[in-house]
Structure formats: C-alpha cells, structure tokens
Amino acid sequence: AWELTILHTNDVHSRLEQTSEDSSKCVNASRCMGGVARLFTKVQQIRRAEPNVLLLDAGDQYQGTIWFTVYKGAEVAHFMNALRYDAMALGNHEFDNGVEGLIEPLLKEAKFPILSANIKAKGPLASQISGLYLPYKVLPVGDEVVGIVGYTSKETPFLSNPGTNLVFEDEITALQPEVDKLKTLNVNKIIALGHSGFEMDKLIAQKVRGVDVVVGGHSNTFLYTGNPPSKEVPAGKYPFIVTSDDGRKVPVVQAYAFGKYLGYLKIEFDERGNVISSHGNPILLNSSIPEDPSIKADINKWRIKLDNYSTQELGKTIVYLDGSSQSCRFRECNMGNLICDAMINNNLRHTDEMFWNHVSMCILNGGGIRSPIDERNNGTITWENLAAVLPFGGTFDLVQLKGSTLKKAFEHSVHRYGQSTGEFLQVGGIHVVYDLSRKPGDRVVKLDVLCTKCRVPSYDPLKMDEVYKVILPNFLANGGDGFQMIKDELLRHDSGDQDINVVSTYISKMKVIYPAVEGRIKFSTGSH
C-alpha cells in the first residue's frame, strides 16, 4: 500500500493576512485565524512529518479584500509560489479582471500547474493562452505519480468576465476523456480538483470513471468528522463518501473558505491505484499555530502599498451620500441607490441576445450601510471612506429566487417598520410601494421589477411563480437580519465580489457620481 496526504484549500478569496473568526479583518491578533503565514507553518509541519504530500487549491484565490484590488493577482502568484502549491484549479473569480487579468499576473507567474479540463479557448485567444493552463498534470510524488485533472463552474460566464473566446463545457463530459487519457498513460491514481460546488463534486465522483478523489470548491462547503472546532456547521462527514456508478467508494472533500482551515486527507492506495482507505479532517488554522516569520515579514512588506492605496481618490461625488441610519433604515436613501447601481453594473454580462442582461434586481439591507460620505471634502471618495460605509468585508452575491420569496422578503423589510431596524431594504431594478396602515405581512401593495428579457428595460409586476435572479449581500443570502426565507427558499447561490471593491470600481468608472432619491421605494395609505 502507498499513502498520500492531500492538503487542500479553496475559496481563499484574498485572505492573505490572518482574519477574525468570521473571516473579516483581524482585530485581536491572539484570536485571529488563517492567513498565508500561518498556513505555511502548518503545511511545512505536515511536510516535515510525512513523505508524500500534495498541496492543492480548488480555485477562487482571486477577489475578496483590498489585497486583490491593489495587486490584482500578483499577490496570489507570489504567495502561492512561496507556499509551493503543487497545483491549482481555476475558479470563476479568477476571471474577474478578464482573461488578461488572469494570464499576466497569475498564469505567467505561477510556478505550479493551473488546471481546467472544461475550459476551451477559441479564436485569437487559443494561441495566446496555450500551455498557460492545462486540462491535467501528472505530478511525481515520492516513487509514484499522481494525475490531477481540473474543472471550473460552467456558470462562470454569468458570474465573472471570461470574455467570448473561452467556452465552458459541461464538467463531466469534459473530464471523462482527460481521465481516460491519464489511464492510457498508466496513471492509476487520479484526483479531480475543481471549482463547481459540492453538488457537482459529488456528481463527478459518481459519474467520471477513474477518478479516485474529488477535491472541490465554490460552495464553501464545510465537512467534518466529529466535533467541529469552530462556528462552521458541517454539511456532512469528512471525507464525504460517494459510491460511483461503477461501485467504487470515492472520497469528496472541501475545506470551507477564506483560508480558515487547511483540508487534510490521507489516502491509502493499493498497488493498482485503488483507494483502500481515506480519512482526515480540516485543520482549523487558529492562533495555536504560529505565523511563519519569513512569510509574515513578506506580508508586512507587501502590506505597505495597501495602506497608501486606502487614502487615494477613487472618484468624486457632487452630492451628499446619505448613508445615515435615520434615512437608510426608514426610506429610500441615495447611498443605497448608489450601492445597488454598482452591484448591478458589476454584474453586466451580455451572454444572450434575448436579454439586455441576465440580472436586473438588487436588494440591500439598510442596516448594512454604516456611514454617509460628505461631499464637502472636495467631493473626494477614498477606499477608506467606503470601508466606513461597508465595514463588514462581505460580498455581493447572485441568487435565484421565486417571486413569492421576494414578496416575503419585502414584507419582512417593513414588518416592524419604525424601530430603526436593519432589515429595511434598499433596492435597484425594483419599485415597491408599502402601505404601513396594513398589518405586518400584508404591507406590500405594489412590487414591480425591471425586465431582463427585453431590449428596452421596463417595470412589470412581480410574478409569484417566476424565478428571478437577484444581486444581494452574502449576509442576506445567508438569512441575516431575519431574512430566513431567502436562505431557506433560494434556488441557487453563487458568491460574488467584495462589497467595497464593487462600489469602488463603479465610482472609478463613473469618475463623478450624483445618486438621487428617485421613487424606488414609496409609501401610501388607502385603497389600491
């Protein structure tokens, strides 16, 4: 028998520095977690103790903090090289700055293979990107070889900016021939490493003949065997065992997100490459693991540029940006409108001639807007200003909801109106009218939404049974501020870009902004 240790991360999302337990900015260092310096210590400790170790990443290193905003992927290549990753799969967020924003900082600089079998380049891009990412890679490990085959969510064109010259094929259809190829090369130990979410990971384990282990990402799935060490609730045991269609037991793993855990899976293979046993657990990277001094010094060195960036002007406002709780928790506020407009703008994807865009709606809890921005400071808006407005380090995500769920959400928005509570919704691509004289749960008297399947966008009444795409904070997607109906009834959830980054990009693009209060949210009394 031959034993392999697989160390894995996924959805790190630019958390190069240690973070608080909830993966936001580290405040009390003695209670902070993760970060590449701490990750390096644990990885090296395991490499010290075990002879056959692979360190893999299942995508979405890009996007999530000011590190990505400033360094644009150069930081990912540099620190992943320093940690000596053995392979990485492309995630959807690796395309956030377009194909060029992937090629130059990451693909050309990485000293490890970057993989995806279901992304096919065409046109002029095909020769430009040739060899920079691969469908699979055979890695020598000790006296053996291990095949790693990559995959990426086929929803990427709706979630990011891969352009028109990359085709995202069905994962299973694309993976099978590559695995077959590895088998003909006498590679009998094969890991599928990819970024399509836990449901697809399980399908790959079930359907793709010859895959021995699946290491996934995208859905931020936390798996654990035994008592979990922090706040995350396991979605199943680690590893999650899937019985394949040809009767094999295939371990599937994922390691939550944000570099909080290091996935640790030990696999025992027989001489024919069959999995005899698999066991392990994610390792919580808490403060009991010291940050490596060499990597930490490097982080501190790279950090300097971030501090300078925070105070530079992104753009100007010629109006007061009212982010006060007195406004945003009671009525339409222009800061809410600005943020929602930025959220929609960030999700413009012309992927179908029938649709002007795939999504037109935004909702945003007023309690998530934490500060106004005064225009009387020469109109200057900085990252620092935006960090005061959006201090929680969240993301603006894409969900699919039924109209009936949206209606419930808007009823919840005003169910206890007047108490300055955070659930009051700011909107974009939505016109809502409330009648507060009616009883809670029956106060939404008009709810019109902007069409997407139209050449001239206009507002139509919400249909209860129709499925709509909506951009919203991850806080709401996870049921925050009492929006349990969103969490319970959402049909799809894809994590998006860092909230501050979305707004800062929009302001930089617009140069001068002047958001108004324009009647998106109205109040009425009497008959309708």
């Epitope: 490499r47 103790a49 075990e50 320093a82 000596r84 490596d292 060499s294 010094a297 490097d298 501190n300």
Partner: antibody
Framework: DVKLVESGGGLVQPGGSRKLSCAAS????????MHWVRQAPEKGLEWVAY????????YYADTVRGRFTISRDNSKNTLFLQLTSLRSEDTAIYYC??????????????WGQGTTVTVSS | DIVMTQSPASLAVSLGQRATISCRAS??????????MNWFQQKPGQPPKLLIY???NQGSGVPARFSGSGSGTDFSLNIHPMEEDDTAMYFC?????????FGGGTRLEIK
C-alpha cells in the same frame, strides 16, 4: 521522524577534494531548503551554504565561495557538498541542516549528527 | 556581515534559578516587523538543537522554561527554572541576511 545522515568525511590532503552527502528521510525532502554548517574543533558554528527546495536559490559563505558546491537530488532525497581546493582551516565537523522554509531561507530546524573532514598532510 | 556578540562567555546558575544569556547584533536583525534571531543549544558530541526562532517562538518540543525576547539589536534567552539537563553551549544566530552568522557561544553550567 525526520532523519538527516551525513557521510563522506575523512582525511584529505591540502588542495584535495571531497564530496559530502546527506541522506534525508521521514519527511517531504523536496519541500525544504537545506544548509551546510560547520564547526571547527573547539570552535563556534559557521554557516557554509544554502540551497532552496527546488535548487533555484543558492548562497555561499565568502570563505568557501568558488571552492565548495552545494547541490541536491530530490528524487533521491539527498543533499551534497562538493569540497575542492581544501585548506587546513576547512577542518571541521560538517552538519547538514534543514531549513523550515522552502524557497527562501528561514531557520535551521533539524540537524544531522555531522561528518568530520580533516585537512592535513 | 552582521556580527553577533554573546555574553557572558560562560555562566554558572543554581538549579531552579534563572539563567539569562544576551546577544547583541552589530546591526538590526529586524525586517518588516519580524526579528530574525534564533537560539540553539548544543551538548557535547551532539549537533545543535533549535530552541527559539524569530526571537520569541519556541521550537518544536522545546520545554516552556526556555523563552526568548528582544528586537532590533538586543536579544536574550531565558531559562527558568534551571535544570541539570540544561548544561550545554548556547548559540544565538541571525537569519535576517546572508551570510547567516552565529554568536561565539555561552557555556552554561550548574553552580
């Protein structure tokens, strides 16, 4: 368990050559930088040379540059130090030490038992 | 090169008492907020063993009675309470820049 075993020491004439080896086991050798450190009889420690995990980065002490060559074979889990143009002041116990770092040096965390090189006519 | 000066050259301490060894660097060994100072213990006929790295972090399996402190150019190694097994040579070493340099050593014995 981490094990580093040096070999190849012995008596060499001034101007002569010697190749030291360090066999590593019990860990993923290819993930760690490696050093040679020497200690002259009844003296302190002197760092000699460093090689990164993938052999991309190599450093030498001024006292040995041009005479000693550090190399490694990751497939055989072995570190080498080729000694040439030996002088009497090169007489020492030669330790191989692993670095906790990978591509850039960090700190020596494990040491072998050492092999003795005596340069004398 | 950074010159490391250790003091005292030798030290005798009673069992259960505190032993303090100092090390001064000819220039700062700090780099971006990290002090690249390490301490080693060496017993006769044995290779050195890592005690402390980055000024204050304990090496793997090192007893809690060994602690390190300092920054910039001035560092110290503390052993408390002193045990019989602690009789050895102690070396400081900087890993801020090439060439890595060691102090001349401090011989610690029981009084």
């Amino acid at each position: 368990d981490v094990k580093l075993v040096e070999s190849g020491g012995g008596l060499v004439q001034p101007g002569g050559s010697r190749k030291l080896s360090c066999a590593a086991s019990g860990f993923t050798f290819s993930s760690f930088g490696m050093h040679w450190v020497r200690q002259a009889p009844e003296k302190g420690l002197e760092w000699v040379a460093y090689i990164s995990s993938g052999s991309r980065t190599i450093y030498y002490a001024d006292t040995v540059r041009g005479r000693f060559t550090i190399s490694r074979d990751n497939s055989k889990n072995t570190l080498f130090l080729q000694l040439t143009s030996l002088r009497s002041e090169d007489t020492a116990i030669y330790y191989c030490a692993s670095d906790f770092g990978s591509s850039s040096p960090n700190y020596f965390d494990y040491w072998g038992q050492g092999t003795t090189v005596t340069v004398s006519s | 090169d950074i010159v490391m000066t250790q003091s005292p050259a030798s030290l005798a301490v009673s069992l259960g008492q505190r032993a303090t060894i100092s090390c001064r660097a000819s220039e700062s060994v700090d780099n971006y907020g990290i002090s690249f100072m390490n301490w080693f213990q060496q017993k006769p006929g044995q290779p050195p063993k890592l005690l402390i790295y980055a000024a204050s972090n304990q090496g793997s399996g090192v007893p809690a009675r060994f602690s390190g402190s300092g920054s910039g150019t001035d560092f110290s190694l503390n052993i408390h309470p002193m045990e019989e097994d602690d009789t050895a040579m102690y070396f400081c070493q900087q890993s801020k820049e090439v060439p890595w340099t060691f102090g001349g050593g401090t011989r610690l014995e029981i009084k």
